[in-house]
Interface confidence: low
Amino acid sequence: RDKVMSEFNNNFRQQMENYPKNNHTASILDRMQADFKCCGAANYTDWEKIPSMSKNRVPDSCCINVTVGCGINFNEKAIHKEGCVEKIGGWLRKNVLEQKLISEEDLGGEQKLISEEDLHHHHHH
């Protein structure tokens, strides 16, 4: 499990770096953050470390009430502060690993998913 979570953490951070450059990666991370009410890998401050993301900005999908541009010059009280790796990882543990529905090899597909899909260039609106 620790290995799975470590890989998921590394992959999530890697995809964060791709967020400003790849629209399809952005769309998947946006949906994850919106669905799981989380922001960043460990927490929302992780977005500060992304070179091509401007300071004082997180994706709009981090906002508690998502509106266009809500992540720019955000107020801490208006965004989800909890990190996605722990939150999604906890969900995976509860719903997947503990039910023994999938193996660690299957979870490896989650790492593969976005990186394989990134080979295709998708635009979004």
Partner: antibody, heavy 119, light 108 residues
Amino acid sequence: QVQLVESGGGLVKPGGSLRLSCAVSGFTYTDYFMNWIRQAPGKGLEWVSYISNSGAIKYYADSVKGRFTISRDNAKNSLYLQMNGLRADDTAVYYCVRDPRSYYGFDYWGQGTLVTVSS
Amino acid sequence: DIQMTQSPSSLSASVGDRVTITCRASQSISNFLNWYQQKPGKAPRLLIYGASNLQSGVPSRFSGGGSGTDFTLTISSLQPADFATYYCQQSFSNPPVTFGQGTRLEIN
């Protein structure tokens, strides 16, 4: 009970436009992402577009990008699909669909509205 | 995009039979797989979510299984109301979600 009722379908010529509407009731609309999913006659299901609960996040299938626009009016509990540049292969029943969370399936569907694109 | 392939495309069976429909994903989707039933002229109905969880109100004769790339929908004892078309759908890569081509279950 949860209800989703589509309207606005009909016959339109290729290149024409149509606006579909979906009136929802029976749940807190602002809690849910919403989708349009279509089904060509005698064919399978194809996801078209989704919109986040606030309306800020929107995504489209490649087949409709640049031609279709999804929107919602949370005050009116309504979902819309503006369809421009319609083509024959857009002919389908269009369903308005509630999306509780991306990993839990589409739990409520409208009855559908038929869009026919033909000259 | 992730491709979903169902088999068989159509299936004939009798009331009381045990029936299994399979769905294969082009890459691992963990357990993010849903099953729907659709009757002619009606909207699809969610049966199973998360590969194996029964949606509220769905009879217990329906069950789902599998993980990774291979999944099954099983009807333990077919009832007249079960003759319909069944679709699988992945929600792992979202957007876009993708559906299988459908399996038509007919009366033998």
